[in-house]
Amino acid sequence: VLLRAREAAQFLRPRQRRAYQVFEEAKQGHLERECVEEVCSKEEAREVFENDPETEYFYPRYQECMRKYGRPEEKNPDFAKCVQNLPDQCTPNPCDKKGTHICQDLMGNFFCVCTDGWGGRLCDKDVNECVQKNGGCSQVCHNKPGSFQCACHSGFSLASDGQTCQDIDECTDSDTCGDARCKNLPGSYSCLCDEGYTYSSKEKTCQDVDECQQDRCEQTCVNSPGSYTCHCDGRGGLKLSPDMDTCEDILPCVPFSMAKSVKSLYLGRMFSGTPVIRLRFKRLQPTRLLAEFDFRTFDPEGVLFFAGGRSDSTWIVLGLRAGRLELQLRYNGVGRITSSGPTINHGMWQTISVEELERNLVIKVNKDAVMKIAVAGELFQLERGLYHLNLTVGGIPFKESELVQPINPRLDGCMRSWNWLNGEDSAIQETVKANTKMQCFSVTERGSFFPGNGFATYRLNYTRTSLDVGTETTWEVKVVARIRPATDTGVLLALVGDDDVVPISVALVDYHSTKKLKKQLVVLAVEDVALALMEIKVCDSQEHTVTVSLREGEATLEVDGTKGQSEVSTAQLQERLDTLKTHLQGSVHTYVGGLPEVSVISAPVTAFYRGCMTLEVNGKILDLDTASYKHSDITSHSCPPVEHATP
């Protein structure tokens, strides 16, 4: 058995003093004879004790005994007892009863031998065992009077050795965390929830964190179970930044050659079909019409110019139908229509002239006469001494229905080097120079150009009642979009209900919303739910074909012939398609290139598309000139080319 240093010292001391104990007993006998039976002097007492300290201790007390109990000769038993006790320093016991093992009598002194856990001269001081090596406890040491006790922190229990602490596995109790996952920890446990949830100790359940309360999003925030999504004002030209919380500008990733020619006149600026230029010619001198200009278009139909007077009198309209020149004319109320010449909507410049001769109108293409029409009368009409002629470019000054044969007057075409009536008047040139919207792109290709700030709308029907299936209404939405995008974000096509719900949208997006991952994708969605996604190399300057097919029980998205990945379960898809069918049976408008002012959360993308695009819906090519509405900056049949970096 190993003893602590203090205990060993206390154990050894009594052994050293055993010889002294024998001497003490002899001394008691001398004291009896010398000082109890008769009075002894101090010298006699010294002879008994044979040392000064004990004599000095004894003699004053001896005198006190005599004062209290009388001299020896009086034979008072209390006197004898009083004197006999004086040499024994342990009587009465000066040591603390509770902490003392034994009191040892010394020469004029005493020594208290303490029990374990006590210390001090009188063994009345508690020893703090916890000071030294934590009392041997592995965690908590509690000092107690004369003792100590090991204890453990919450989550631990004391081993049988009374010193070691062992971890308690709280997770063995299934009720510890309730619905949450329980993870045992040293001395503790943790109730874990999936990301986006927080543990409620009160309900013992995982509760959704409303991240929107934490102002994480720069603009619009939508909370969802376990997550949230931020939305940016796409119509305002913003998209989500890579951090998925803040917004950034939608910037072009493909540069289009947007240079315009100041010496050109763009005919397609007014979607209303109203003329881009109105000229009023008045002469005192009789004058004949001579109109000459260079012209370029890919558009198959539209009005180049009108010249004449009121709709019911005398006028001519030079237009295009099916890509060939057509002249409609009315002389003194009698209408005629002539079409001839080559197809000229090939996108190359050609010179066109219309000349009024004495009894003929001659139309030339590149100086070759393609039409010669006999006419009876003059285009300039004499009124109150002055010859009048109104000339409008890119439209007519009256309703299309008043033409000999109605035509869609909208013409995405370009004129340059014009000469009206040998006119040297710089008015048109000055007006065009001051207004870039009246100018044409210097170079164009086939397609329709969406500048990223507007859309076109159509009233299309996607449902039909099949007679062979009774009155069962079937529906189908098949879209083929050939795109050459300039930006990575934007709506290609969408269907919008009267209540601003977006039953279908097909759009370019640069992130995966659920995975919160930046990626160039095409998304097919019903309302705000993505049905399918497909990767696209949107910024490679190449043309890509996006095909979408939606019908009863089916929703597919393809990019360049590769099928996209479904984002919903079969059940979810069916539920979404049922929702779509309901919308299609109501009133829907088809939007191309963007969305109206709907909520940013009504569809995955609300930004305007920027780039080239031609669309086919349910097998029919969409002609932007036949739209219900088109933003005037969208060019219906022409597109600027991609700007290739010069080496």
Epitope: R280, F281, K282, R283, L284, Q285, P286, T287, E383, R384, G385, L386, H388, L421, N422, E424, D425
Partner: antibody, heavy 116, light 107 residues
Amino acid sequence: QIQLVQSGPELKKPGETVKISCRASGYTFTNYGMNWVKQAPGKGLKWMGWINTNTGEPTYTEEFKGRFAFSLETSATTAYLQINDLKNEDTATYFCARDEGWFVYWGQGTLITVSA
Amino acid sequence: ETTVTQSPASLSVATGEKVTIRCITSTDIDDDMNWYQQKPGEPPKLLISEGNTLRPGVPSRFSSSGYGTDFVFTIENTLSEDVADYYCLQTDSVPLTFGAGTKLELK
């Protein structure tokens, strides 16, 4: 560019004749008629009439019928205004102006002073 | 003959002020009214042609309105360079007739 350049000022006595020229350049002369406008000192503008540059046929307003004559020299792309039997009230600046129903291009004007 | 009555004959304004000149015709001339500016020793300059059309190069402080028989010519924020005589001209019918003119001076 289109220009109409008129002959210089003239000082004439009453009863004399004056012929003012207006030379046109920068356009096809015969495509546009030529107008003449009178402005007496400190007074307003008065349209005198015009001449058809194709046929040479003149048209005069009532006030300027009789002593006034418009003529042409097509080969020289020039129009003329002749005033016979000058009177004091003929003292004025005479402008030629190209016919466009209204007047965009004007000559610089020729001052004719009639004084005994 | 359509007569044109122009008013006022003269007016004096401070720079920055608005100027309004009126022409009334004796017959309905639709919008066949033109407005000219003439500075001393120079031929008249066409500012606005038929249909209230501002001519190329003419500052936008000049404008006109009117249809039928009542026409107004306006200069917003008059500048010292606008000191001149101003004439209206009807081109609806022959003979063409001018207004008597308005002399614009600066105070």
